[in-house]
Structures are given as C-alpha cells and as structure tokens.
C-alpha cells in the first residue's frame, strides 16, 4: 500500500518511518532518497544514517525524532512544489532479503491565500502525537536467525499505526491522506 502525505508550500513536511531496535542504540543503517526504492540503497539520497549517527544529510532534510529509538522519520523544511514526489525510506536490516522498503508519496499544495483555520496545525507539530498512538494493526515481527542482538519488530507503514485509530480524522484535517491497500 502507498501512503500519501500532503503539505503546503512553505510548511514543513513529515514523512514517517520507524523501526524498533533490539536495544536502545542498537541501530541499523537507514537511507532516505527521492524516488521509489530501488533494489539496493536509495536513489537520489537526501539523508543517510549508519549504526551510530546521521552521516549524510542536506540542509532541509532532517531527522527530528528519536533516532536512537528507531524513529527515522524525515522532516523536509520549508517545502516547495519541487519537493512533491515519491520518497524512499530503506531500513537496511542484516540478513537475507530483510531490508524494509517504504515508498511514501508527498504532495505539495500551493500555499493558501486566505488565513488558515485554527483547526489546521503545522504538519510537523501534528505528527509527533502519533508516536504515542497505540497501533491497532498487527505488528510484523522478523527474527533474524543467528544474527546477534537483532530482533526487530517492524512498524511496516504508518497505515498500520493508524488503522482504526481515532487520530485518522485529526490527520485528515491536518492534510494527510492515508490509503490502506
């Protein structure tokens, strides 16, 4: 399933991507790229992490969540229409064909001329609430055989996090469209 996110020109856009390290700080490499996920890595890399830290990023692309707990969600600051498109989040899990690949569609709308209603919030401010949301869909668990110290519960998409969630309406008001396929 493809998940679609919307933001207005000039706003910050938030593209969620998560995994659960076996232990805090037991990290795996992650890359973000513009374009659908290819066979390996990410195309047109905009941000990359290794087992310790963010080791490559460009100015408007940031991780603002708790990277050390597996929140590798991407924030794109001050978006323009050119930021529209598919983004790939790739979680490079050791083992045979274990990489998690997520394609997220970002739609940028022209800025509204009229003042925004008070109901609408900054996209970035709206989404951190989701980190405390209890997922209602079953989590997908992967045990990586004999690989040491890694047993990841993948949060496969934001759609799983939000399935049947009362936040869905809130998010729709914030401009996010969740398509569960």
């Amino acid at each position: 399933s493809e998940v679609e996110y919307r933001a207005e020109v000039g706003q910050n856009a938030y593209l969620p991507c998560f995994y659960t390290p076996a232990a805090p700080g037991n990290l795996v490499p992650v890359c973000w790229g513009k374009g659908a996920c290819p066979v390996f890595e990410c195309g047109n890399v905009v941000l990359r992490t290794d087992e310790r830290d963010v080791n490559y990023w460009t100015s408007r692309y940031q991780l603002k969540g708790n990277f050390y707990k597996g929140d590798v969600s991407l924030t794109i600051e001050n978006v323009t229409l050119a930021d529209s498109g598919i983004y790939c989040c790739r979680i490079q899990i050791p083992g045979i064909m274990n990489d998690e690949k997520f394609n997220l569609k970002l739609v940028i709308k022209p800025a509204k001329v009229t003042p925004a209603p008070t109901r609408q919030r900054d996209f970035t401010a709206a989404f951190p609430r989701m980190l405390t949301t209890r997922g209602h869909g079953p989590a997908e668990t992967q045990t990586l055989g004999s690989l040491p110290d890694i047993n990841l519960t993948q949060i496969s998409t934001l759609a799983n996090e939000l399935r049947d969630s009362r936040l869905a309406n809130d998010l729709r008001d914030s401009g996010a469209t969740i398509r569960i396929g």
């Epitope: 490499p29 047109n44 274990n98």
Partner: antibody, heavy 120, light 107 residues
Framework: QVQLQESGPGLVKPSQTLSLTCTVS??????????WSWTRQHPGMGLEWIGY???????YYTPSLKSRLTISVDTSKNQFSLKLSSVTAADTAVYYC????????????WGQGTLVTVSS | EIVLTQSPATLSLSPGERATLSCRAS??????LAWYQQKPGQAPRLLIY???NRATGIPARFSGSGSGTDFTLTISSLEPEDFAVYYC?????????FGGGTKVEIK
C-alpha cells in the same frame, strides 16, 4: 583504489559445491559504503547477477539460485565468498566479484573473473 | 522479473561516427538503469548510472538518456577503444537484470 581478485577451483564435479573467494585490497571490506556482489557470465552469453552482501549485512540472492546460494563475508581476511551447491553443467561460467559504491552508485570495481567449469 | 531488450544486436560503425544504442524494459524502471561496456576477456565497466549520470572517469562522449521503459546510450564520436559489447542493467526491481547486449563492431 579498491581491487578485487577471485580465487577458487576452475573445475567442479556435478552435484558438488562451487566455492569462490574474492579478496579485497585497497580498502576495508568492513567499512561502510560498498555492496559486495557476484555476477556470472555463461560462455558466449550475457551477464547474470547472482547476489550481493552489503556493508550493513543485508544479503540479496537472485531467486533462481537462492536455494543453492550462500554469500558471506570474512572481515578478518578482507574477503567475501560465494558457495553454490548441487552444481550442474549449467553453472559453468565466468564468475566475477565486484563492489558497488553505495554513495551514489557512481563507480564500481570488478575482479578479472574466473572460469569455473562443471564437468565430471 | 523485468526483461530488458537491447537493440540492435549488432551495430557496425566506423571510428568517428555516432552510435545510438537502445534498451527497452518490460515495465517501468524509473531512472534506475545502468550501462556497462565489456571487451573480450575483460570484466564489465560501468559507464552510466541512473539513466544519465556518467560514472567516475568515463569520457564525456558517452551519454545516457531516458526514463520509465525506454533508454538510450549515445557515443557521440566512436574512438577505436569503444568497439565492445554494451549491456544495460536495471536496478529498480529485484532481481537485477541485464539486457542481452549490443555489439558495436568496426565497419
């Protein structure tokens, strides 16, 4: 500059296991940024990607060989290897090891290739 | 798996001429297409990645174009060392696949 060198027996009997090693020089196999791969080329034919192992430990095998294939890394020897079990004459090929730069895919390095013949 | 069809199978040209090689994918590969050159007895050499980006050290006479399903490798003016077999490779979907190759030979 990274250099790669394949080694292993040039002749393997049918039903046995083909084992090849690729020795990496000019760089550490455990440092980030490279994918270590195997590709083969049947005599007079085109190229067939076999699989890769990444700097992070991600491993991908081509589906047609997956059940017979193992790719692994030995960081202490700066080598990675290929094992292909239950070989037949159809596995006769030149086997190439290669590394791909993951930081934009703008360069890769290949070994010179080694011919493996499967015959009794 | 994605099938890559290269045409023509053989291209007979003289040094200094322009070579145009085609690669067509059975489904979209976005821009995740690479071109390799292979000479007899040698390993393949990466020329172009992501459809249009020249790899490190590749001369400017090599250029790539296209996206989706149709791609072209152009050699603007053939040098003697350019006569070889050229393969396209898609990196969009697993398994990675190569085209059958185009042989550029001296006319």
């Amino acid at each position: 500059q990274v250099q790669l060198q394949e080694s292993g027996p040039g002749l393997v009997k049918p039903s046995q296991t083909l084992s090849l090693t690729c020795t990496v020089s000019g760089g550490s196999i455990s440092s980030g940024g490279y994918y270590w791969s195997w590709t083969r080329q049947h005599p007079g034919m085109g190229l067939e990607w076999i699989g890769y192992i990444s700097y992070s430990g991600s491993i991908y095998y081509t589906p047609s060989l997956k059940s017979r294939l193992t790719i692994s890394v030995d960081t202490s020897k700066n080598q990675f290897s290929l094992k292909l079990s239950s070989v037949t004459a159809a596995d006769t090929a030149v086997y190439y090891c290669a590394s791909l730069d993951s930081w934009g895919s703008n360069r890769d390095y290949w070994g010179q290739g080694t011919l493996v013949t499967v015959s009794s | 798996e994605i099938v890559l069809t290269q045409s023509p199978a053989t291209l007979s040209l003289s040094p200094g001429e322009r070579a145009t090689l085609s690669c067509r994918a059975s489904q979209s590969v976005s821009s995740y297409l690479a071109w390799y050159q292979q000479k007899p007895g040698q390993a393949p050499r990466l020329l172009i990645y992501d459809a249009s980006n020249r790899a490190t050290g590749i001369p400017a006479r090599f250029s790539g174009s296209g996206s989706g399903t149709d791609f072209t490798l152009t050699i603007s003016s053939l040098e003697p060392e350019d006569f070889a077999v050229y393969y396209c490779q898609q990196r969009s979907n697993w398994p990675l696949t190569f085209g059958g190759g185009t042989k550029v030979e001296i006319k």
